[in-house]
Structures are given as structure tokens and as C-alpha cells.
Interface confidence: medium
Amino acid sequence: TNQCTVRYNVADCSHLKLTHIPDDLPSNITVLNLTHNQLRRLPPTNFTRYSQLAILDAGFNSISKLEPELCQILPLLKVLNLQHNELSQISDQTFVFCTNLTELDLMSNSIHKIKSNPFKNQKNLIKLDLSHNGLSSTKLGTGVQLENLQELLLAKNKILALRSEELEFLGNSSLRKLDLSSNPLKEFSPGCFQTIGKLFALLLNNAQLNPHLTEKLCWELSNTSIQNLSLANNQLLATSESTFSGLKWTNLTQLDLSYNNLHDVGNGSFSYLPSLRYLSLEYNNIQRLSPRSFYGLSNLRYLSLKRAFTKQSVSLASHPNIDDFSFQWLKYLEYLNMDDNNIPSTKSNTFTGLVSLKYLSLSKTFTSLQTLTNETFVSLAHSPLLTLNLTKNHISKIANGTFSWLGQLRILDLGLNEIEQKLSGQEWRGLRNIFEIYLSYNKYLQLSTSSFALVPSLQRLMLRRVALKNVDISPSPFRPLRNLTILDLSNNNIANINEDLLEGLENLEILDFQHNNLARLWKRANPGGPVNFLKGLSHLHILNLESNGLDEIPVGVFKNLFELKSINLGLNNLNKLEPFIFDDQTSLRSLNLQKNLITSVEKDVFGPPFQNLNSLDMRFNPFDCTCESISWFVNWINQTHTNISELSTHYLCNTPHHYYGFPLKLFDTSSCKDSAPFEL
């Protein structure tokens, strides 16, 4: 018997070192995966049993010959994948019976030459992959054929020239994608693309195109249907007004010029591309943008300048420069990414003219933006910005009114900086529509009563690992945030808070309070009694109190928190939990108590929260394997559908001595009083 796995109508026989086709698979399979074996042939007679096959994948084998009768035996075959084999020749007969094929993958074989018309009968073919084969010509046949072809992949071959007579076989095709990447192209002969019925996307990445060849290419694309042109990873060191001039008579909408070591973007380089909507200039070496660099891009919606500029060297003069008004022509631009650059700072008119901009990413963009002032973003005053990413910019101070120009902003990300200040609240002046402020991973933030008084619309506030100070002031800094649904105060070593810290936050759904120091606040011996800072949070869904040193949970602290779905109390020092503390948590889905000091799991504590649990984590607790301590728990474990991972290995008895290291689930409860499962 074979070791193939069969699920529904799919047989997976991959990676089995097969030298022959298995003969005992179900006869109704429609998909057969034979990849990564040691097959040398696909004998047609061996497939007689599998006449329902629609997809046959025999990639990554050692097949050197294909017999025409295979498709006769498999009349419903639509996808044939033979990539990474040893086919060296295909003749007129090879696919003669494969009339119903829609996809044929011959990538990574040794087909150096196409003789005559091996694809003449493939009138249903929509995808043909001949990349990585050593072909020296695009000619796949004489006479018009492959009229339904949509994707022709010829990357990584040895094609030196594109000639009209070698592409005329595509005269009736509407190619959605022609990939000629990684070919050493040196010539685009006149009319070479005109012979293709329609060509919508052309990929010429890594094709060693210089500026002159690029210009020639664009003229050959003139008056075609081209919409998407990818010229990434060439040697397009400079562009000028003439580089893309041939594209004037096209409706090009996407252009990828990434990874070109592009140094000089000449004025008017894009002036002939009024239909362009997407432009990528990622990973280049641009020295300067001037007010006419983007002239003509009147319909551009998306522009990526990620890592597009010169990297700084010893000389300060090598700093890339973005002149004022460089973006002034991009009146429909909605998305601008300038991540990972070495721009010194913003100027008063850096972003002027971007009157449709919604998403601006400036992560790790600036070298001298330590202080944000009310001038930093003045050039965005007329932009309807919704999202602003300012992460990783070594920002240390935010001045009052910095964001006052951004009245429509919804998401402000200031994480992963070095902000070190007292938040007066004036920093956020004017952010009247703000939804989320992300401040996590900064140096030091001191709160005041008015820190967030000017942003009542805020729904998400992230303050993780910011050495937060003054959390215990009254009234609470969070009091104005009536709409808050997510609050992250984790990793701040907070030890002192008041009972009214979260008062009035009735809409809070997620509270992250892990990695703080709340242990004293929940002790009975705490002066003034335990601090119940969770009261009134009636819509709380997720509560994380991991790693807080907690060794007590006061009675009533979870009372009325009926909507709690997840509680994480892992990595604390909890031992004996009071009865009934989880009585209102009957809707709980996830409970994490791993790495505590829990010895007993009793019904009056855990019965209610276990009722509807999907997931329980109580690993690494020192369970006391006695009837009183765990018989109810063991019985529950053995009849529940709750997911309890690593139950066999990480739920082990600690006491009594003779049970040490014994798996909890194997504890025999039959001799325990009142242990019957129906008691649950």
C-alpha cells in the first residue's frame, strides 16, 4: 500500500521517493500531487484508473519525456504542472491531446528551443510558464494560436531580443501578464509589441535595462493596451523627460521602478504618465526631489518612496533633499510611504499640495526630527490625513499644538521613539477625530489630569513600556476618555493606582495591565483595603494581569464583569483562590493561570468560569494530587471539550511525594467520594 494521503478528492503523494505511479488510489480523485519524487516517466496506462483527474502536479521529479497519450487517458485534465524536471524537447505531438488544459507549467526544465507548434491545440490555455529554460527566443509557434492565453511567463531565459515575427503567434491573445524578467535583453525591434493582440502587464525586472533601452522599450509600448509595467532591479540610474515619453499614448496605471540604484529623477520624468495611479520608487539612491520631479502625475493615488533616497555617508552634504513643493502636483495622492530614509526633517512646504492624502508613513524617515513642533506638519494643513506613522524617528519631545493641523486624523503612531516628557494634553490639541494614539515603547511619560482631556473621541490608547509616572493622580488621567475601548498600560512597573483609575470607562473592552507590580494593591492587608480598580467595567472582554506578583485575588474584584471572555493571570504567585470569585464569569472563553502556585482546583472556585471555556492554560502549577484538591478537576478534564494544551506533559503532580511528576489526567478519581462526572 502507498503512503499517500487522500482527503476528499485530493491525493497527496509528494516527498515519498516514488519511482512509479501508485495504482491503489481512489479512482474518483480529481487532484493528484506527485511532486518531489523520483519519477522518470508518466506512463499513460498507469493513469487509466484516474480518469477524473483535473489537476496533475508532477513537479520536482526527473521526467525527461512526456507521452502524448497521457492527455487522452485524462480527458478532464485542466492543470498540468511539470516544473523542475528534465524535459529537453517538446514536439508537435507532446500536448496534441491536451485540448482542455487551462494551465501548463514547464518552468525549470531544459527546453532550449521550441520547434514547430507544440501549443497549437491549446486553445483553452490561460497560463503557460516556460521560465528558467534557456530559451533564446519568444517564438512558441508559427501562425496565430493560444487565443485564450492570459499569462505567459518567460522569465530567466536567454532571450536577447524581442522581435515582432517572434511574437506574432499571440496576435489574437489578450495577455494579462507577460513576464520577461531576468533575460539579457538588448533589443526591442520596431513593432514587437504591436503584434500581440492585447498586452496589459509587462514585467521586465532584472533585465539589465539602461536608460536608453528603457526609452526604446517605452516607445515600442506606445499605442498598446499596457496598464502595468514593472522595471524593478535594472540599472536605470537616471530618468529624464524623454525616458517614459513613449508611454504618452498609453493608459499606464502602474509603474514599478524599485531597486534601480536610481540617483537622478530629472524634472518632468513622469510628465507623460497622466493615467498613472501607482508608482513605486522603493530601494533607490535618489539624491534630490525638486518641485518638478513629479510633474504630470495628476492621477497618482499611491506612491512608495520607502528606502528611495541616498543613504547618509560621512559627508553631511550627502543628505538627500526634498525641496519644498516637491509633491505639489499629486493632488489625488492618497497613500505616501517614505519609510527608512535619511531625510533631515520636514520643511514648511514639504507636503504642500497633497490635498487628498489619507495615509502617510514616515517610519524611520528623519535624522533630525528629535522635537516635533507646531511647524513640523504645517504643510499637511490642507490634507485630509487619516493615518500618520511616525515610529522609529528618535523623537524625544512633542510640543504643544504639533498636530493641530490634522483635524481629520484617526490613527497616530508615535511608538518606538525616545519621547521623554510630561504630557500636558496640549500636545493633542486639534485632534478632534482621533481614534487611536500609539505611544508604546518610548522613554518616559509623566501623566497629568489633563493629559488626554482634549481627545475625548479616543478609542484606543497604547502606553506599553513607557516608564509611566503619575498614574495614581486624581482625577484619573483617563477620566475624559469615555469612548475608550482598548487601553494598554503594560510593562510599566506600576505599583500605585487609585480605585478611580478607570472610573467612567464603561466602553472599555480590552485592558492590558501585564508586567506591572500590582501585588500589594490586591492584598487584604493593604492599608485601606484592596483596590478594586476594575469596578464598573461592565463591557470588559479581555483582561491581562500576567506577571504582576499577585498572590491574592480579593473577593468581588471580578463581580459584575459579566462580559469577560479572556482572563490572563499567568506568571503570578496565586495559591489559594477564594470561593465564588469567578461566579460572574460564566461567559469566559479563555483562562490563563499558568506558572502560579495553584495546588487545588475546586468546583466552587472554577465551576462557573469553566462552563463555556474554549481554552484553559494551567501548566506548570504544583498540583496537590489528593481527592480533596483535584478530583473534581480531573473529572472535568476527562469530559470537557475545552482545549488544554500539553495536558500530558505540563500538568504534573507536585504532592504528595509518591505522586511527584505523575500526569494529573491519569490520577484515579474512582475511589474519591462525590467524584462522579454527573456531579459536575
Epitope: 478528492n9 483535473a54 489537476i55 485542466k78 504542472n81 482542455n100 487551462t102 486553445k123 483553452n124 485564450n148
Partner: nanobody, 115 residues
Framework: EVQLVESGGGLVQAGGSLRLSCVAS????????TGWYRQAPGKQRDLVAE???????IYADSVKGRSTISRDNAKNTVYLQMNSLKPEDTAVYFC?????????WGQGTQVTVSS
Amino acid sequence: EVQLVESGGGLVQAGGSLRLSCVASGSPFSIGATGWYRQAPGKQRDLVAEIYPSGDTIYADSVKGRSTISRDNAKNTVYLQMNSLKPEDTAVYFCNVVRWGVDYWGQGTQVTVSS
């Protein structure tokens, strides 16, 4: 990702007609081959009819002359018109599309032919 939703099944008298529809979302029908298969209780799933990008069609012998497969690219829909129905046509009818090397199936629609 392609989603297929069949409709049009039901209970019909022998000799009657039905028109099954299959709507695809996520990928237009102009790409690839689209077919109808059927599975009677306790039997394997068998091809009924299939239509190709070129417009070519193929039919199982058991339905030839009684069924017509067609498609409307604008509506992303493929149809199976079945006439002169027989009790042996009773089955769950499934729509099938092959897209970029993946075999997609609908949930099926029940056709019951009573005598």
C-alpha cells in the same frame, strides 16, 4: 480565493425541467474551465457538463441532448439547463472551477426527480 454558490435545485416531476445557476465571487469566469458534477447517494461524484474558455463544452453521455451548459461572464455565472428529467438524475449537483492550480467546489444543490 474563489467562492461558488449553487442554486436552482428542487423537486420536479419526471419529464420536467430545471435550470441550475452557479455564481462565482473572487475570480471571473473568463478564466479557466467551469463545470457541473453530480453525486447520487452512495455513488461517486461524476461530471455532468463542462465549459471551457474557448466556449467549447463537453457532456456526460447520460445527459447529452437533454442538458445545456452556458455562462454569463458579466454576471460571473454558469448555468445548467436540464430538460426531460429522469428519476436517475436525482443527485446533489456541484459547481466546480479550477483557478490557478486549485480545485474549487460549491456546497451543492439537491435535485430530486419523482416518478
